[in-house]
Structure formats: structure tokens, C-alpha cells
Amino acid sequence: SEGRKTWRRRGQQPPPPPRTEAAPAAGQPVESFPLDFTAVEGNMDSFMAQVKSLAQSLYPCSAQQLNEDLRLHLLLNTSVTCNDGSPAGYYLKESRGSRRWLLFLEGGWYCFNRENCDSRYDTMRRLMSSRDWPRTRTGTGILSSQPEENPYWWNANMVFIPYCSSDVWSGASSKSEKNEYAFMGALIIQEVVRELLGRGLSGAKVLLLAGSSAGGTGVLLNVDRVAEQLEKLGYPAIQVRGLADSGWFLDNKQYRHTDCVDTITCAPTEAIRRGIRYWNGVVPERCRRQFQEGEEWNCFFGYKVYPTLRCPVFVVQWLFDEAQLTVDNVHLTGQPVQEGLRLYIQNLGRELRHTLKDVPASFAPACLSHEIIIRSHWTDVQVKGTSLPRALHCWDRSLHDSHKASKTPLKGCPVHLVDSCPWPHCNPSCPTVRDQFTGQEMNVAQFLMHMGFDMQTVAQPQGLEPSELLGMLSNGS
């Protein structure tokens, strides 16, 4: 799906506030703090332009920022392994001035039996072994150290944890005579955290466990365990938070039911049910106890596990997620979409929106896409005029202020951003879609017509003429 999408830059807008660094006391580590913008709200554009100019002029002074790469560290504890028994690891870029740590869990589906794991090993070995991992990786999107690309947390310590356990980061079983593969996703996270404590994490103020796709689900499954681990190791003051991107799936009815023969056609509930047994999967204790023995698979679904979590979690989810559609056996092949399928897709968006209504920190654009936070142009999409980095900044502020009595949302700083328009790409800031076959970019109108939406039908509920609607969609209102 990656090849089908491109990201377009929106018109120049002032970026969300960069994280400005406070002047440290002598001998103290530098730390960033949230800015209070209430005094400048009337003239925000000019103020932001000055802040950006200042940030850009100071940026070259920081020599450590010039190297964008995260460097590979294989785990010292070699008993914590990838599927094939090679040591797991992580990529790290330290930012010694910051007490923020971002740990990112990579995604990449899963396998749940010997047959489809063998097939995965043949075709996607990098997701099962560390043998061919490159020595360095470039941080992109939320892992970028460039304030222009990452206005949210550019100065954080960045950690990328490659996905090589094929178990949605839930497994706790090692390779043995009996087990051809190890599934140690949950243990890999614990070991990475343990080793990072010796590399500066011990001084952290905030640890943000983020992830995309299977990594996003991994966040939901592991964020409380990381907090508990740090507490047990004597670091109760580190605030652990989660950022789950494209990992909030529904256990809904497939568009067309197919037997569970491979990863992609198998209904998610059945795949996870089989997977948990195969991986010796672990789920958060507070979720597990809500379900009967053998029903732990429920905890892989965001809307069921989220209410049981202690740590704050920000949920990012496309309303029309491509991975969700894939497991639901919806394949957009380039042929115009029949009405039954169109209604199914619209209903999916409606169901997903419903599951997010009690998630205070969420960002859900009405787009057909998958993953966002480590894409370079992750700043481009907006919901109700707010970009994702801005929403994350507002979330930080709301958590920073949460010990105060006020529970009301910060004025002009929203954190619950869920599109309410009902069809894919009704949000004009969605990533541009390319035709699968020609590679041509499609505008929103072309895409909707390709999807089988009659513009008259789409415009009518909005009280608009089709021409008015097309104009609005094209100019981004």
C-alpha cells in the first residue's frame, strides 16, 4: 500500500509551536517546557514566524543534531531474540539535553502458524531476523530531529525498535527443540527499556512508547507493563505514555467471509486467537481479567483494551484504514465500487468513529490510508484545522496541567480530533491517492467517483449542490 500513496504539502501555514528549550541551571541538563501562548493568541502567525526564524538560526549551533542517523545496538542479553534466534536490538539517537525519550515500535503484520511463519521468513526475513539489519537508520516523521519535520518532539532521545518477532509485540516464548521460532515481542520491549536505563533513560521525565500498525497495537499491549517495569526497577517518577498509530482495529464482520488460510485473509479475531496460543502471547493484566480464559484475544482490540489502561494513550487512526479493509476482505482493485461495498466502507468509518468517542486524546482523519507518524509529511494532515503534531503538543500540555484542578480542555488547543464527514477522503488534507495501475494522482472528486460515490448523493445530505461540494473539496474548506 505504501507505493500507492503520496503525501502533498499543504499551503504554507505556521508550524505548531516548536518545543523551546529552557535555560538550565548550572550543571543541570537542558529541558524543554511547554510555552503558554495565551498572551500572543491575537497575533499568532507573526509570533510563530519569529519563533521559527529563531529556531532555524539556532539550529546549526547544535553539532549533535547534524547527524540524523539512529545507530543500531543489538541487545547485550542475547537470549532475547528475533524469531530466528538472532539477537533483537534497537536504533538509538541520543539527545543529551532532553529528558524525553521516544521509543517507537515498528509494524509489519504477523504470522500465526508454522506455515505462514515459514513463508514470512522466506519473503520478509528482515521482520524475523536481525542478521541483515543496517548499522544506521534515518529518523523520519516523529523520529526526526529536524524541527521542520518534527515540530512536536524534535529534541527527544529517539529509539526505533525493529519488529522481528511477528507477534504484535505480545510474545513471551523462546526458540527451542519444540519451537522452530521464538516469539519474544513483549520481552524485547522490556529488555530494550532495561538496557536504555544504562544509556540515560534513568534520567527521563517522559517516556513515550509509540508505534505504527502492529506496533500501534503493541503500544496498547505494552504501555502499562513498561510503566510497571520502571516502577519495579526504582524509577516511579518517569511518566509513561502511549501513542498508538494505525493499531486500533475493529473485530467487525468481514465484507466477505473467507477461511483462515493466511495472514491477510484470516479474520482478525481468528488470527489473533490462533496467534496468542502460538506465540504464548501476553496481554495487559487489567484487560485479561475482564475476559474468560481463552478469550484474551479481545485485548488486542483497541476499544476493548483502552479503557483498562492506566497510562495516558493518544490514538491516531485513519477512519478508513487500509489494513483494516484488507483483513475485512475489501480490495480496491481499480474497478468502480459497488453500492454494497461503498455502504460497508462508510459503515466502517462510522463504527470506528463510535469507538473513539470516549477516547479523549485521538486524531482520526476520514482518509483511506495506513500509518502516519514516521512519514516525513506527517504534519500535513489536519482534522478540524489542527495538525497531528499540534494535537500532540496540546495533549502534552493537558497532561502537564492534569495535576491542577481544571479538567476542561485547553482553549484553542484540542486533543479530541475525529472527522465527522462520512466518506473516504472527505477531508481535503488527506494524503493524495494514486491510481494503482496508472500511478496518476487522483483528486478528491476523481477518487470519490472511482469509489462509486454519486456526487449528487454525497452533496445532498450537506445541503449543497455537487458543484459547490467539489469546489469546497478542492480548496480545502
Epitope: A227, Q239, V240, Q290, E293, R310
Partner: antibody, heavy 118, light 114 residues
């Protein structure tokens, strides 16, 4: 509205086994956990154990070897069994509904008195 | 196990007076990641079962009069009754639900009316 009602034997002899039933209404045992708490005469509250919505149990380690909690979701009943009764098990026994995910006891039964005496 | 201590064990006040009782835990009940304190207060009137008054250290349950206020963080907590009424005669218990098993209660503070 939410209600819990305990029913127990009242008087028992040492070394016997205790069985108390808690019948609930106004909520489902498949959605909420139920805890057992006791209070010796003139003393404070002691948490004994919990049965979660999914059926798993946790016990106070001081009594774990003598305690067993179970339930019947369809009958909306929770049961506590305690064997090898001693005189210091004399207490008022309460069942309490928990809020969904934490050990907050938001509704309590009226309690049932157990006297252990020879 | 987390040990909960309450003081005073009893006190007698006149109607209309302000009352403060404290609860101390042997370890912090503040979960730093969500800034919540896992502490509840219960009221037990003579011959009745306990009733939940306050959860999360300071969140008053619906139907609880606003003269009852919970405060504090970490290991030190307070329940304040701003102006005592005759019906407030009861034993008040604090309870931690930060860590289990077991969840533990304080020994109680008995409030008597002069």
C-alpha cells in the same frame, strides 16, 4: 438499581467450612468484579479476595490457602468458601461490587454475620 | 503489602465544626504517568455497611454532600468535613487500590458528635 445481598449460616463450629452466597441485581457479573471483605466485631475492614468479570480470582495471601471464590453468572451469584474455621474468623462478611477496572468498592451488601464458637 | 494508617483514631466535635482526618500510606499511591492517586474514602454509619464517599483521593461520588472533601497526594491524604452535621456520626476508612493483592484499609477514624 444495584443491590447485593449476602446469605450465610450465622453460627458455625471451629474447623468447619463456611459457605456464603452473594446474590446481585442491577448489574451483570460478566461486566464487573465482586470482592469479599470482612469486619470483626468493633474492628476495621479486611479485604479477602475478588472474582473478576472474566472469572479469574485473587486472594489476600494471609487467607489464600483457606479461601475459594467462585460465581454463577447466569444466576447472578458469587460464592465464598472458607475452610478450617477458627474463632477469629468471627466477623461480618460483606460482598461488594467493584468499579469496572479498579479496586474501588462502589456498592456493598448489608453483610452477613458469622460467629465461630464451640 | 501497603500499610494504611489513619489518625486520629477517634474525635468528638460539635455540629457545625470543621473536621479533618488524615490517612498515610507506607508507599506512594500516585501513579506518575496519569497523575492519579489510587485512594478511596468510605463512611460506615453504626449498624450499616460502608458507603463510598471519595475515589481517586479527591473525586466525590454522586450524591455525596459537598461538605465532604478529599485531598492529598503521594502518601498523605486528608478527608475534610467543612461543617459537621449530626448524620455524619460514623467511622471513616481510607483504602488504597494502587497495588494488590491485597487492597488494604486504614484502621478507621471514629467521628462522634458532642
Amino acid at each position: 438499581q444495584v443491590q447485593l445481598k449476602e446469605s450465610g449460616p450465622g453460627l458455625m463450629a471451629p474447623s468447619q467450612s463456611l459457605s456464603i452466597t452473594c446474590t446481585v441485581s442491577g448489574f451483570s457479573l460478566t461486566d464487573y468484579g465482586v470482592s469479599w471483605i470482612r469486619q470483626p466485631p468493633g474492628k476495621g475492614l479486611e479485604w479477602l479476595g475478588v472474582i473478576w468479570a472474566g472469572g479469574s480470582t485473587d486472594y489476600n495471601s494471609t487467607l489464600k490457602s483457606r479461601l475459594s471464590i467462585s460465581k454463577d453468572n447466569s444466576k447472578s451469584q458469587v460464592f465464598i468458601k472458607m475452610n478450617s474455621l477458627q474463632t477469629d474468623d468471627t466477623a461480618m462478611y460483606y460482598c461488594a461490587k467493584q468499579n469496572r477496572y479498579d479496586g474501588i468498592f462502589d456498592y456493598w451488601g448489608q453483610g452477613t454475620t458469622l460467629t465461630v464458637s464451640s | 503489602d501497603i500499610v494504611m494508617s489513619q489518625s486520629p483514631s477517634s474525635l468528638a466535635v460539635s455540629v457545625g465544626e470543621k473536621v479533618t482526618m488524615t490517612c498515610t500510606s507506607s508507599q506512594s499511591l500516585l501513579f506518575s504517568s496519569n497523575q492519579k492517586n489510587y485512594l478511596a474514602w468510605y463512611q460506615q454509619k453504626p449498624g450499616q455497611s460502608p458507603k463510598l464517599l471519595v475515589s481517586w483521593a479527591s473525586t466525590r461520588e454522586s450524591g455525596v454532600p459537598d461538605r465532604f472533601t478529599g485531598s492529598g497526594s503521594g502518601t498523605d491524604f486528608t478527608l475534610t468535613i467543612s461543617s459537621v452535621e449530626a448524620e455524619d456520626l460514623a467511622v471513616y476508612y481510607c483504602q488504597q487500590y494502587y497495588s494488590y493483592p491485597p487492597w488494604t484499609f486504614g484502621g478507621g477514624t471514629k467521628l462522634e458528635i458532642k
